[in-house]
């Protein structure tokens, strides 16, 4: 079932079906014998009440008041009371656009990213029985797709996607046909959820160290799901019996990134090891960042200015 | 519209150098990193390497080190590479494309080593 | 470096039929911490540059016809089109962005039989 109208100010198009359904609709079904009225006040009038004699186009049933269709003098307040329970709308109606298949005021605004799933659906559940078709167009030319009962486009967002769609569904009533369009203004970003890989700490590192002694270099970043970090060094990777990789340590943070530290392990610090880059390299889709680390000899330590040096 | 355009063919002779150009639209430049393809007449695709543009920083392949320099002007989200000493062998279609899964292609720049 | 390298080098397939490629890497392009392959797939057309079909593997890009899809982990891909058109006759290429030197497989040739 329909869900009923909890707005308080609401804005239509002239020409189109519209209708106003009050919230105590189950409770309304309890008591049936309780009088139920609907009443208008605009400007100079004071709540008059409604009935299918005020006008030929408007229909009252149990919940609903029924607009065939809604036209600029129906702008006003309106009141559903029954018994001590009162709901009250302001309703707005405004120009339709006569240059275009939609008005610009009555436009639902969507950002979708790139890649990310886009979807329009056509339907109208409240008018659903009484809908002959309904054609989906895109800035107002007409997309060829094969439901047209509802039509739908579902798909991975491309830059090309972005424009204004509407749904425009075609109904019968009373031998009169009537349509009702509803306009969605797509705009299509770049992915926001992506950060630019940041290495955290100095770019260069002396670490003082004692040969045959062990160390661990770590390498620590905050990075994208994925996002890459690694170790390099030497000419190959792995020729070094001694140097070992550990696993990748990730914790995600708060904000939906990763926190991801990497430890490069050397056992047995020989001359060979010293003086040499070991560079860790973060990867995105956004290029590389690198930050290296030098083993120096502790005797060495005199050489360098103490605030180069990391533990 | 999201696109790559790239500078006009280039005929150069051996030993010399060569600029391409590659402007980018559509996007926020710095997002993504700007790689060289380069493919040779009825070869394939040969990455020669790529620039961060949010940082400056390069990656090159082996084979162009010391003969390519990748640059980017963010003012004008335009990205350049430049190869030096060129040889016949260079004749190919370079391309620049972004990211590192390649879903945007400039069309393509050839460039002819003759003498 | 890690090195592609795609079987056969070229295939004809009957117009509506199934046509594989494969795609081994030298080494795992499979990243452990977030359990994606980072692996991409490419056709390329005479005149034209390549276009991106196929990333981490097996996620379609936006616009190609989901009779393309793509398989495999670690060192071992396929791409495969279900029902052959006319307009899928062109080169493909697997690409590796695991680690630089980002690498291509040297391609297959697809036509039709």
């Known amino acids: 079932a329909e869900s009923c109208t909890s707005r308080p100010h609401i804005t239509v198009v002239e020409g189109e079906p519209f209708y106003l359904k009050h919230c105590s609709c189950s409770l309304a079904h309890e008591i049936e014998t309780t009088t139920k009225s609907w009443y208008k006040s605009s400007g100079s009038q004071e709540h008059v009440e409604l009935n299918p004699r005020s006008s030929s186009r408007i229909a009252l049933h149990d919940c609903v008041l029924e607009f065939w269709p809604v036209e600029l003098n129906d702008t006003g307040s309106y009141f559903f009371q029954m018994k001590n329970y009162t709901q009250k709308w302001k309703l707005n109606v405004i120009r339709r656009n006569k240059h275009s298949c939609f008005t610009e005021r009555q436009v639902t605004s969507k950002i979708v990213e790139v890649k990310k799933f886009f979807q329009i659906t056509c339907e109208n559940s409240y008018y659903q029985t009484l809908v002959n078709s309904t054609s989906l167009y895109k800035n107002c030319k007409k997309l060829l797709l094969e439901n047209n009962k509802n039509p739908t486009i579902k798909k991975n967002a491309e830059f090309e996607d972005q424009g204004y769609y509407s749904c425009v569904h075609f109904l019968h009533h009373n031998g009169k046909l009537f349509n009702i369009t509803k306009t969605f203004n797509i705009t299509i970003v770049e992915d926001r959820s992506n950060i630019v890989p940041v290495l955290l700490g100095p770019k260069l590192n002396h670490v003082a160290v004692e040969l045959g002694k062990n160390v661990r270099l770590n390498c620590s970043a905050l990075l994208n799901e994925e996002d890459v970090i690694y170790w390099m060094f030497g000419e190959e990777n792995g020729s070094d019996p001694n140097i070992h990789e550990e696993k990748e340590m990730r914790i995600m943070t708060p904000e939906g990134k990763w926190h991801a530290s990497k430890v490069l392990r050397i056992e047995n610090i020989g001359e060979s090891n010293l003086n040499v880059l070991y560079n860790c390299t973060v990867a995105s889709t956004g290029g590389t960042d690198t930050k290296s680390f030098i083993l120096v000899r502790k005797a060495d330590m005199a050489d360098i200015p103490g605030h180069v040096f990391t533990r | 519209q999201v696109q790559l355009v790239q500078s006009g063919a280039e005929v150069k002779k051996p030993g010399a150098s060569v600029k391409v150009s590659c402007k980018a639209s559509g996007y926020t430049f710095s997002s993504y990193g700007i790689s060289w393809v380069r493919q040779a007449p009825g070869q394939g695709l040969e990455w020669m390497g790529w620039?961060?543009?949010?940082?400056?920083?390069?990656d090159y392949a082996q084979k162009f080190q010391g003969r390519v320099t990748m640059t980017t002007d963010t003012s004008t989200s335009t990205a350049y590479m430049e190869l030096r000493s060129l040889r016949s062998d260079d004749t190919a279609i370079y391309f620049c494309?972004?990211?590192?899964?390649?879903?945007?292609w400039g069309r393509g720049t050839l460039v002819t080593v003759s003498s | 470096d890690i090195v592609m390298t795609q079987s056969p080098d070229s295939l004809a397939v009957s117009l509506g039929e199934r046509a594989t490629i494969n795609c081994k890497s030298s080494?795992?392009?499979?990243?452990?911490?977030?359990?994606?392959?980072?692996l991409a797939w490419y056709q390329q057309k005479p005149g034209q540059p390549p276009t991106l079909l196929i990333y981490?593997?097996?996620t379609r890009e936006s616009g190609v016809p989901d009779r393309f899809s793509g398989g495999g982990s670690g060192t071992d891909f396929t791409l495969t089109i279900s029902s052959l058109q006319a307009e899928d006759v062109a080169i493909y290429y697997c690409?590796?962005?695991?680690?630089?030197?980002?690498?291509f497989g040297q391609g297959t040739k697809l036509d039709i039989k």
């Open positions: 981490w593997s097996s």
């Open positions: 494309t972004r990211g590192w899964y390649f879903d945007l």
């Open positions: 690409q590796q962005y695991y680690r630089t030197p980002y690498t």
């Open positions: 620039i961060s543009v949010y940082n400056g920083n390069t």
């Open positions: 080494q795992t392009v499979l990243y452990s911490s977030n359990n994606k392959n980072y």
